[in-house]
Protein backbone atom coordinates (compact mmCIF):
# COMPACT_ATOMS: atom_id res chain seq x y z
CA UNK A 1 0.00 0.00 0.00
CA UNK A 2 1.38 3.40 -1.03
CA UNK A 3 1.25 5.97 1.77
CA UNK A 4 2.25 9.61 2.09
CA UNK A 5 1.63 12.52 4.42
CA UNK A 6 -1.81 14.09 4.30
CA UNK A 7 -2.32 17.27 2.35
CA UNK A 8 -2.11 20.56 4.22
CA UNK A 9 -5.89 20.99 4.16
CA UNK A 10 -6.13 17.94 6.43
CA UNK A 11 -4.12 19.62 9.19
CA UNK A 12 -6.29 19.08 12.24
CA UNK A 13 -8.20 16.16 10.74
CA UNK A 14 -6.76 13.78 13.31
CA UNK A 15 -7.50 15.20 16.76
CA UNK A 16 -4.94 13.12 18.64
CA UNK A 17 -2.81 11.37 16.06
CA UNK A 18 -0.92 11.50 12.80
CA UNK A 19 -2.70 11.81 9.45
CA UNK A 20 -1.58 9.44 6.71
CA UNK A 21 -2.86 9.41 3.12
CA UNK A 22 -3.46 5.89 1.84
CA UNK A 23 -2.99 6.62 -1.84
CA UNK A 24 -4.28 3.36 -3.32
CA UNK A 25 -7.37 3.45 -1.11
CA UNK A 26 -8.02 7.15 -1.82
CA UNK A 27 -8.45 7.98 1.85
CA UNK A 28 -6.92 9.59 4.87
CA UNK A 29 -6.16 7.50 7.93
CA UNK A 30 -5.45 8.60 11.49
CA UNK A 31 -2.71 6.78 13.40
CA UNK A 32 -3.84 7.50 16.95
CA UNK A 33 -1.70 8.39 19.92
CA UNK A 34 -1.74 5.94 22.81
CA UNK A 35 -4.99 6.30 24.71
CA UNK A 36 -7.07 7.54 21.78
CA UNK A 37 -9.38 5.77 19.34
CA UNK A 38 -11.98 6.58 16.69
CA UNK A 39 -11.71 7.36 12.98
CA UNK A 40 -10.24 10.76 13.84
CA UNK A 41 -8.70 9.79 17.20
CA UNK A 42 -11.44 11.78 18.88
CA UNK A 43 -12.20 9.35 21.72
CA UNK A 44 -10.11 8.94 24.85
CA UNK A 45 -10.05 5.61 26.61
CA UNK A 46 -8.26 4.46 29.75
Amino acid sequence: VSITKCNSDMNGYCLHGQCIYLVDMSQNYCRCEVGYTGVRCEHFYL
Partner: antibody
Framework: QDQLVQSGAEVKKPGASVKVSCKAS????????IQWVRQAPGQGLEWMGR????????KYREKFEGRVTITADTSTNTAYMELSSLRSEDTAVYYC?????????WGQGTLVTVSS | RIQMTQSPSSLSASVGDRVTITCKAS??????IAWYQQKPGQAPRLLIQ???TLQPGVPSRFSGSGSGTDYTFTISSLQPEDIATYYC????????FGGGTKVEIK
Protein backbone atom coordinates in the same frame (compact mmCIF):
# COMPACT_ATOMS: atom_id res chain seq x y z
CA GLN B 1 -24.03 1.63 0.86
CA ASP B 2 -22.74 5.17 1.36
CA GLN B 3 -24.93 7.94 0.00
CA LEU B 4 -25.24 11.72 -0.03
CA VAL B 5 -28.81 12.72 -0.79
CA GLN B 6 -29.43 16.39 -1.51
CA SER B 7 -32.64 18.40 -1.27
CA GLY B 8 -34.73 19.12 -4.34
CA ALA B 9 -34.56 21.89 -6.93
CA GLU B 10 -35.34 25.43 -5.83
CA VAL B 11 -36.51 28.57 -7.62
CA LYS B 12 -35.68 31.83 -5.85
CA LYS B 13 -36.06 35.53 -6.54
CA PRO B 14 -33.05 37.87 -6.65
CA GLY B 15 -32.09 39.04 -3.16
CA ALA B 16 -33.52 35.95 -1.47
CA SER B 17 -31.62 33.15 0.28
CA VAL B 18 -31.50 29.42 -0.39
CA LYS B 19 -30.55 26.58 1.94
CA VAL B 20 -29.54 23.26 0.38
CA SER B 21 -29.34 20.13 2.50
CA CYS B 22 -27.09 17.09 2.08
CA LYS B 23 -28.06 14.02 4.13
CA ALA B 24 -25.50 11.28 4.57
CA SER B 25 -26.29 7.63 5.03
CA UNK B 26 -23.97 4.68 5.46
CA UNK B 27 -21.29 6.76 7.17
CA UNK B 28 -20.92 9.37 9.89
CA UNK B 29 -20.29 12.91 8.64
CA UNK B 30 -18.18 13.54 11.78
CA UNK B 31 -15.57 11.26 10.21
CA UNK B 32 -15.32 13.43 7.09
CA UNK B 33 -15.14 16.93 5.69
CA ILE B 34 -18.10 18.05 3.56
CA GLN B 35 -17.22 20.27 0.62
CA TRP B 36 -19.61 22.31 -1.53
CA VAL B 37 -19.06 22.83 -5.26
CA ARG B 38 -21.26 24.56 -7.78
CA GLN B 39 -21.59 24.61 -11.55
CA ALA B 40 -23.45 27.29 -13.47
CA PRO B 41 -25.07 26.24 -16.78
CA GLY B 42 -22.41 25.64 -19.41
CA GLN B 43 -19.67 26.70 -16.98
CA GLY B 44 -16.92 25.00 -15.02
CA LEU B 45 -16.77 23.62 -11.49
CA GLU B 46 -16.31 26.10 -8.65
CA TRP B 47 -15.34 25.20 -5.08
CA MET B 48 -17.33 27.21 -2.54
CA GLY B 49 -16.16 25.99 0.84
CA ARG B 50 -16.20 23.17 3.33
CA UNK B 51 -17.03 22.19 6.88
CA UNK B 52 -15.42 19.88 9.39
CA UNK B 53 -18.61 18.59 11.09
CA UNK B 54 -16.74 17.22 14.10
CA UNK B 55 -15.20 20.57 15.07
CA UNK B 56 -17.63 22.85 13.27
CA UNK B 57 -14.75 24.61 11.49
CA UNK B 58 -15.51 26.15 8.11
CA LYS B 59 -13.41 27.48 5.23
CA TYR B 60 -14.85 29.52 2.38
CA ARG B 61 -13.63 30.70 -0.97
CA GLU B 62 -12.97 34.43 -0.71
CA LYS B 63 -15.56 35.39 -3.33
CA PHE B 64 -18.33 33.83 -1.22
CA GLU B 65 -17.22 35.13 2.19
CA GLY B 66 -20.11 36.85 3.95
CA ARG B 67 -22.69 35.39 1.57
CA VAL B 68 -22.35 31.66 2.17
CA THR B 69 -22.82 29.73 5.41
CA ILE B 70 -22.02 26.03 5.66
CA THR B 71 -23.31 24.17 8.70
CA ALA B 72 -23.72 20.59 9.85
CA ASP B 73 -26.13 18.84 12.18
CA THR B 74 -24.36 15.73 13.41
CA SER B 75 -27.51 14.45 15.13
CA THR B 76 -29.23 14.07 11.75
CA ASN B 77 -26.02 13.41 9.78
CA THR B 78 -26.83 16.32 7.50
CA ALA B 79 -24.80 19.22 6.10
CA TYR B 80 -26.25 22.47 4.81
CA MET B 81 -25.16 25.26 2.49
CA GLU B 82 -26.99 28.58 2.68
CA LEU B 83 -26.36 31.28 0.09
CA SER B 84 -27.84 34.73 0.61
CA SER B 85 -28.39 37.85 -1.52
CA LEU B 86 -28.98 35.66 -4.54
CA ARG B 87 -28.45 37.02 -8.03
CA SER B 88 -29.02 35.53 -11.47
CA GLU B 89 -25.36 34.44 -11.68
CA ASP B 90 -25.99 32.09 -8.73
CA THR B 91 -28.19 29.91 -10.94
CA ALA B 92 -26.30 26.63 -10.81
CA VAL B 93 -26.23 23.02 -9.73
CA TYR B 94 -24.88 22.80 -6.18
CA TYR B 95 -23.08 19.63 -5.09
CA CYS B 96 -22.03 18.41 -1.68
CA UNK B 97 -18.90 16.27 -1.67
CA UNK B 98 -17.52 14.00 1.00
CA UNK B 99 -13.77 13.97 1.54
CA UNK B 100 -11.46 12.65 4.23
CA UNK B 101 -12.32 9.01 4.80
CA UNK B 102 -12.91 8.58 1.07
CA UNK B 103 -11.71 10.82 -1.71
CA UNK B 104 -14.50 12.83 -3.24
CA UNK B 105 -17.82 11.05 -3.06
CA TRP B 106 -20.47 13.35 -4.61
CA GLY B 107 -24.14 14.01 -3.99
CA GLN B 108 -26.52 14.05 -6.92
CA GLY B 109 -26.66 17.84 -7.12
CA THR B 110 -29.37 20.43 -6.49
CA LEU B 111 -30.44 22.90 -9.16
CA VAL B 112 -31.00 26.40 -7.82
CA THR B 113 -32.58 28.83 -10.26
CA VAL B 114 -32.57 32.54 -9.51
CA SER B 115 -35.14 34.40 -11.55
CA SER B 116 -37.44 37.36 -11.10
CA ARG C 1 -5.46 30.98 -2.88
CA ILE C 2 -3.88 28.51 -5.30
CA GLN C 3 -4.75 29.14 -8.96
CA MET C 4 -4.97 26.31 -11.50
CA THR C 5 -4.41 27.13 -15.15
CA GLN C 6 -5.71 24.37 -17.41
CA SER C 7 -4.98 24.16 -21.13
CA PRO C 8 -6.22 23.88 -23.75
CA SER C 9 -9.80 24.98 -23.07
CA SER C 10 -10.99 22.77 -25.91
CA LEU C 11 -9.51 20.33 -28.39
CA SER C 12 -10.61 18.21 -31.31
CA ALA C 13 -8.92 14.89 -32.01
CA SER C 14 -9.50 11.72 -34.00
CA VAL C 15 -10.39 8.34 -32.55
CA GLY C 16 -7.15 6.62 -31.59
CA ASP C 17 -5.22 9.86 -31.09
CA ARG C 18 -3.18 10.60 -28.01
CA VAL C 19 -4.68 13.52 -26.09
CA THR C 20 -2.80 15.58 -23.52
CA ILE C 21 -4.18 18.17 -21.10
CA THR C 22 -2.02 20.22 -18.74
CA CYS C 23 -2.64 22.01 -15.48
CA LYS C 24 -0.23 24.48 -13.93
CA ALA C 25 -0.55 25.44 -10.28
CA SER C 26 0.45 28.84 -8.93
CA UNK C 27 2.52 27.07 -6.25
CA UNK C 28 3.77 23.59 -5.41
CA UNK C 29 0.77 21.33 -4.74
CA UNK C 30 2.84 18.28 -3.71
CA UNK C 31 1.14 15.94 -6.20
CA UNK C 32 -2.29 16.58 -4.70
CA ILE C 33 -4.10 16.83 -8.00
CA ALA C 34 -7.13 14.91 -9.26
CA TRP C 35 -8.69 14.63 -12.70
CA TYR C 36 -12.42 14.42 -13.41
CA GLN C 37 -14.47 13.56 -16.45
CA GLN C 38 -17.89 15.18 -16.86
CA LYS C 39 -20.47 14.34 -19.48
CA PRO C 40 -23.50 16.59 -20.14
CA GLY C 41 -26.17 16.31 -17.46
CA GLN C 42 -24.01 14.16 -15.20
CA ALA C 43 -22.05 14.76 -12.02
CA PRO C 44 -18.26 14.73 -12.42
CA ARG C 45 -16.60 11.30 -12.33
CA LEU C 46 -13.26 10.93 -10.56
CA LEU C 47 -10.68 9.31 -12.84
CA ILE C 48 -7.34 9.94 -11.12
CA GLN C 49 -6.22 11.20 -7.71
CA UNK C 50 -2.82 11.94 -6.22
CA UNK C 51 -1.41 12.76 -9.70
CA UNK C 52 -1.39 9.25 -11.14
CA THR C 53 -3.54 6.84 -9.12
CA LEU C 54 -6.29 5.48 -11.34
CA GLN C 55 -9.63 4.88 -9.68
CA PRO C 56 -11.18 1.39 -9.81
CA GLY C 57 -12.97 0.72 -13.07
CA VAL C 58 -11.22 3.52 -14.97
CA PRO C 59 -9.68 2.31 -18.26
CA SER C 60 -5.88 2.17 -18.39
CA ARG C 61 -5.79 4.50 -21.41
CA PHE C 62 -6.19 7.32 -18.88
CA SER C 63 -3.04 8.37 -17.03
CA GLY C 64 -1.60 11.28 -15.10
CA SER C 65 1.85 12.56 -14.26
CA GLY C 66 3.70 15.55 -12.88
CA SER C 67 5.12 17.13 -9.75
CA GLY C 68 5.64 20.54 -8.22
CA THR C 69 3.49 22.96 -10.19
CA ASP C 70 3.17 21.14 -13.54
CA TYR C 71 0.79 18.26 -14.19
CA THR C 72 -0.39 16.33 -17.24
CA PHE C 73 -3.41 14.18 -17.99
CA THR C 74 -3.24 11.84 -20.99
CA ILE C 75 -5.66 9.69 -22.94
CA SER C 76 -3.38 7.32 -24.83
CA SER C 77 -5.93 6.36 -27.48
CA LEU C 78 -9.06 8.49 -27.68
CA GLN C 79 -12.34 6.57 -27.81
CA PRO C 80 -15.80 7.89 -28.79
CA GLU C 81 -17.01 7.45 -25.20
CA ASP C 82 -14.25 9.79 -23.98
CA ILE C 83 -16.07 12.81 -25.41
CA ALA C 84 -16.54 14.96 -22.30
CA THR C 85 -15.15 17.90 -20.39
CA TYR C 86 -12.14 17.18 -18.16
CA TYR C 87 -11.20 19.13 -15.05
CA CYS C 88 -8.14 19.15 -12.83
CA UNK C 89 -8.53 19.80 -9.11
CA UNK C 90 -5.83 20.74 -6.64
CA UNK C 91 -6.62 19.62 -3.10
CA UNK C 92 -3.36 20.37 -1.31
CA UNK C 93 -4.55 23.63 0.22
CA UNK C 94 -8.33 23.89 0.19
CA UNK C 95 -9.52 23.26 -3.38
CA UNK C 96 -9.31 24.87 -6.79
CA PHE C 97 -10.55 23.50 -10.10
CA GLY C 98 -8.98 24.18 -13.45
CA GLY C 99 -11.16 25.83 -16.07
CA GLY C 100 -11.89 22.59 -17.91
CA THR C 101 -11.03 21.11 -21.30
CA LYS C 102 -13.77 20.13 -23.72
CA VAL C 103 -12.70 17.12 -25.79
CA GLU C 104 -14.44 16.54 -29.12
CA ILE C 105 -14.04 14.06 -31.95
CA LYS C 106 -12.64 15.42 -35.18
Amino acid sequence: QDQLVQSGAEVKKPGASVKVSCKASGFNIKDTYIQWVRQAPGQGLEWMGRIDPLRGNTKYREKFEGRVTITADTSTNTAYMELSSLRSEDTAVYYCVRSGTLFDFWGQGTLVTVSS
Amino acid sequence: RIQMTQSPSSLSASVGDRVTITCKASQDIHKYIAWYQQKPGQAPRLLIQYTSTLQPGVPSRFSGSGSGTDYTFTISSLQPEDIATYYCLQYDNLRTFGGGTKVEIK
